[in-house]
């Protein structure tokens, strides 16, 4: 293995060798393989516990996987000069537990971060504002992947998981230009009503496996240049009226229903005339009934009015125990 | 009562094709999938692909997507699977089940053999 | 894709005993189903959504688990209940995925 001060374009990667010497800018920090040439550093599967700090400056993409950080401080990536051209960081899988406001400061050019399949019991409301004004300036983010951050039961704070994830990305209306999110896996049992009003630009918003319910107080309205909203494999029952009104306003959406427990009572007649004549939704045939026991495994786009009745609510006088 | 009626056995000689059928009764074909299910003696249960009656629309299992093709007859409310360039692999028995979370209704399979 | 896989393969109970049989899951899933098998017939859809019976199942079978890890039990043995039992994925979109099975006999 070369040591990092060696910069041979022969090989792609060079390991570096620990140095007692103070970091040279193009340096290769322990542990880590760099390629100046495709300007990425790989400090993967190492069990490093903090951000390594001679980072090279020349460094596009930062690969720092399957690590143990438990804490990503503020400021963890500042640097003197800055990491100007740092635009994509992958920090999966690294044991985060805390993510502290302004961890991404100074870091002008971050265009995708991934924090998936870390138990963040603690992210700060700023971590991707850096400032707790009620308007930071914009981040430099398009995409932030955050698959499988919800932290095991008893790691969880007091406030709800998903109120912790909001504040996040609504703090100081940073996030403007964001155009891909992903929040797959995390337990949602609902989404916070005001998140996606400061998303306008979201092309890409995935809540797949999650366990959100109902959409009735969320709006999708503003999300005009949306292309694909995934909500597979949720609990989803039924979409009413004004879910369905805004998802066929979105002038380019594909959305996905996949593997939701649908309901086919009464309440589901709506839904059913909508996916008849809508093109918006993808592989709208495989929608199919799970309850009530006699509709189950039915598809929906075969269902009339007719099928659709709900139990009459017996007045308490004709109940029985 | 729901019932899925497939004949109990057919026979055929390698490298042909044979169009296996599953005669549906007691519900409203279209409005469920039907699926196919090939099980080897002694061993389980291997999902090969479904179809929906109502648009022919079908899903595949990779592993099938060059030997079975899926398709249906409304108007008898029979589904069918063709099963292209026989071997003994393909001996077995062949089940349609009525499905979509579950299969909730089966077929009594058909018995496949491929011999010359 | 999800892989289920069964345990034991094979066991053996005797009239009145419990038996218990597991189905794990590579990844989690949020229920599963299991449909039994006698010997010549076809499978039966048995117990879905991990705990609900199938009409006409006996209220000595029942279903339980999530996340990864799902089970059948039997609180007493009977002949009849001899049989494979396979488990299956809750999906409503390819694949659908089985266990492998097991196979459970009288003594």
């Known amino acids: 293995t070369s040591s990092a001060s060696s910069s041979s374009s022969s090989a792609p990667f060079l390991a570096s060798a620990a140095s007692a010497q103070p970091p040279l800018p193009d340096q290769c920090p322990a542990l880590c393989e760099c390629s100046e040439a495709a300007r990425t550093v790989k400090c993967v599967n190492r069990n490093l516990t903090e951000v390594p700090t001679d980072l090279p400056l020349y460094v596009r993409n930062l690969f720092l996987t399957g690590n143990q950080l438990a804490v990503l401080p503020a400021g963890a990536f500042a640097r003197r000069p800055p990491l100007a051209e740092l635009a994509a960081l992958n920090l999966s899988g690294s044991r985060l537990d805390e993510v502290r406001g302004g961890a991404f400061e100074h870091l002008p050019s971050l265009r995708q971060l991934d924090l998936s399949h870390n138990p963040l019991a603690y992210l700060s409301p700023f971590a991707f504002s850096g400032s707790n004004a009620s308007i930071s300036a914009p981040s430099p983010l398009v995409e932030l992947i955050l698959n499988h951050i919800v932290p095991p039961d008893d790691k969880r704070q007091n406030r709800s998981f998903e109120g912790m994830v909001a504040a996040a990305l609504v703090a100081g209306r940073a996030l403007q230009g964001l155009h891909l999110l992903e929040l797959a896996s995390n337990h949602f049992l609902y989404l916070p009503r005001d998140v996606l009003a400061q998303l306008p630009s979201l092309r890409y918003l995935d809540l797949s496996n999650n366990s959100l319910v109902s959409l009735t107080y969320v709006s999708f309205r503003n999300l005009t240049h949306l292309e694909s909203l995934h909500l597979e494999d949720n609990a989803l029952k039924v979409l009413h009226n004004g879910t369905l009104a805004e998802l066929q306003g979105l002038p380019h959406v594909r959305v996905f229903l996949d593997n939701n427990p649908w309901v086919c009572d009464c309440h589901m007649a709506d839904m059913v005339t909508w996916l008849k004549q809508t093109g918006v939704v993808q592989g709208k045939d495989r929608l199919t009934c799970a309850f009530p026991e006699k509709m189950r495994n039915r598809v929906l786009l075969e269902l009339n009015s007719a099928d659709l009745d709900c139990d009459p609510i017996l007045p308490p006088s004709l109940q029985t125990s | 009562q729901v019932q899925l009626q497939q004949p109990g056995t057919e026979l055929v000689k390698p490298g042909a094709s044979v169009k296996l059928s599953c005669k549906a009764s007691g519900y409203t074909f279209t409005s469920y999938w039907m699926h196919w299910v090939k099980q080897r003696p002694e061993q389980g249960l291997e999902w090969i692909g479904n179809?929906?009656?109502?648009?022919?629309?079908?899903n595949y299992n990779e592993r099938f997507k060059s030997k079975a093709t899926l398709t249906v007859d409304k108007s008898s409310s029979t589904a069918y699977m063709q099963l292209s360039s026989l071997t003994s692999e393909d001996s077995t028995v062949y089940y349609c089940?009525?499905?979509?979370?579950?299969?909730?209704?089966w077929g009594q399979g058909t018995t496949l053999t491929v011999s010359s | 894709q999800v892989v289920l896989t069964q345990s034991p393969a094979i066991m053996s109970a005797s009239p009145g005993e419990k038996v218990t049989m597991t189905c794990s899951a590579s990844?989690?899933?949020?229920?599963i189903h299991w449909y039994q098998q006698r010997s010549g017939t076809s499978p039966k859809r048995w117990i879905y959504?991990?705990?609900k019976l199938t009409s006409g199942v006996p209220v000595r079978f029942s279903g339980s688990g999530s996340g990864t890890s799902f089970s059948l039990t039997i609180s007493s043995m009977e002949a009849e209940d001899a049989a494979t039992y396979y488990c299956q994925q809750w999906t409503s979109k390819p694949p659908w995925t089985f266990g492998g099975g097991t196979k459970l006999e009288i003594k």
């Open positions: 089940a009525r499905g979509g979370w579950d299969f909730d209704y």
């Open positions: 959504d991990t705990s």
């Open positions: 990844s989690s899933v949020r229920y």
């Open positions: 179809i929906n009656p109502s648009n022919g629309n079908t």
